[in-house]
């Protein structure tokens, strides 16, 4: 069980004090007001692949 500040969340995730847990930044599209989404905005997004040539 990770405590805030003891280890960083993995790339593409951010710490939620509300849930006491690292959360996937991808969920911020559906729930933009989640507390961890501020941390996602400050971090680069996870890599994605273009769906067109």
């Amino acid at each position: 069980e990770q405590a805030p500040g003891t280890a960083p969340c993995s790339r593409g995730s951010s710490w939620s004090a509300d849930l006491d847990k690292c959360m996937d930044c991808a969920s911020c599209r559906a729930r933009p007001h989640s507390d961890f989404c501020l941390g996602c905005a400050a971090a680069p997004p996870a890599p994605f692949r273009l769906l067109w040539p």
């Epitope: 069980e1 004090a17 509300d18 729930r31 989640s34």
Partner: antibody, heavy 123, light 111 residues
Framework: QVSLKESGPGILQPSQTLSLTCSFS??????????VSWIRQPSGKGLEWLAH???????RYNPSLKSRLTISKDTSRNQVFLKITSVDTADTATYYC???????????????WGQGTSVTVSS | DIVLTQSPASLAVSLGQRATISCRAS??????????MHWYQQKPGQPPKLLIK???NLESGVPARFSGSGSGTDFILNIHPVEEEDAATYYC?????????FGGGTKLEIK
């Protein structure tokens, strides 16, 4: 619609292990962000959060009781379990399970609760 | 642990008047952009019911006569105008850190 229902032994003796079951419907504990908590309330007193289990099987416990608590789940059967070892008369209370789930504002506090199951520890 | 102290422990309010319940935290339950305070209503023989989440957001189906405010360590639940069905015990709860804790409750009686 969301519903939760607790079940337990009703009465047990000091030093025994209390086993509680929360059976729920209307949501899935495999949904990202979903979780279930156990909370208790001695008669005429306030609420005490005990433990929480997440969709990914991550668990959290109240430090004051952590050594005595074990929370687990059966996602396919829509059930969450709580075990409390070495019970004493101070563990006499109504035990509730409640859901925390994803919401536009973030992650709901405990928005749906069961009706509670009464547990008496007596010799 | 963050201790939540509610006041008063009980109050009696006349029908149609305002009820104000305070919840004070032993340390801040807010960040610069978020306040992790919630309010519940509990009637005898029933489980708690979520009224307000994250300080001021009314849960779906909760009447607009309920409102919440505050930040940091001081939070308020207001009910105005009070109705007969509001007779209950009200609890604050935080989710700023573990363990999640509840206030001791405020019992509201309608005169």
């Amino acid at each position: 619609q969301v519903s939760l229902k607790e079940s337990g032994p009703g009465i047990l003796q000091p030093s025994q292990t209390l086993s509680l079951t929360c059976s729920f419907s209307g949501f899935s504990l495999s949904t990202s962000g979903m979780g279930v908590s156990w909370i208790r309330q001695p008669s005429g007193k306030g609420l005490e959060w005990l433990a929480h289990i997440y969709w990914d099987d991550d668990k959290r416990y109240n430090p004051s009781l952590k050594s005595r608590l074990t929370i687990s789940k059966d996602t396919s059967r829509n059930q969450v379990f709580l075990k409390i070892t070495s019970v004493d008369t101070a563990d006499t209370a109504t035990y509730y399970c409640a859901r925390r789930g994803p919401d536009y504002y973030g992650y709901y506090p405990m928005d749906y609760w069961g009706q509670g199951t009464s547990v008496t520890v007596s010799s | 642990d963050i201790v939540l102290t509610q006041s008063p422990a009980s109050l009696a309010v006349s029908l149609g008047q305002r009820a104000t319940i305070s919840c004070r935290a032993s340390k801040s339950v807010s960040t610069s952009s978020y306040s992790y305070m919630h309010w519940y209503q509990q009637k005898p023989g029933q489980p708690p019911k979520l009224l307000i989440k994250y300080t001021s957001n009314l849960e779906s189906g909760v009447p607009a006569r309920f409102s919440g405010s505050g930040s940091g360590t001081d939070f308020i639940l207001n009910i105005h105008p009070v109705e007969e069905e509001d007779a209950a015990t009200y609890y604050c709860q935080h989710s700023r850190e573990l363990p999640w804790t509840f206030g001791g409750g405020t019992k509201l009686e309608i005169k």
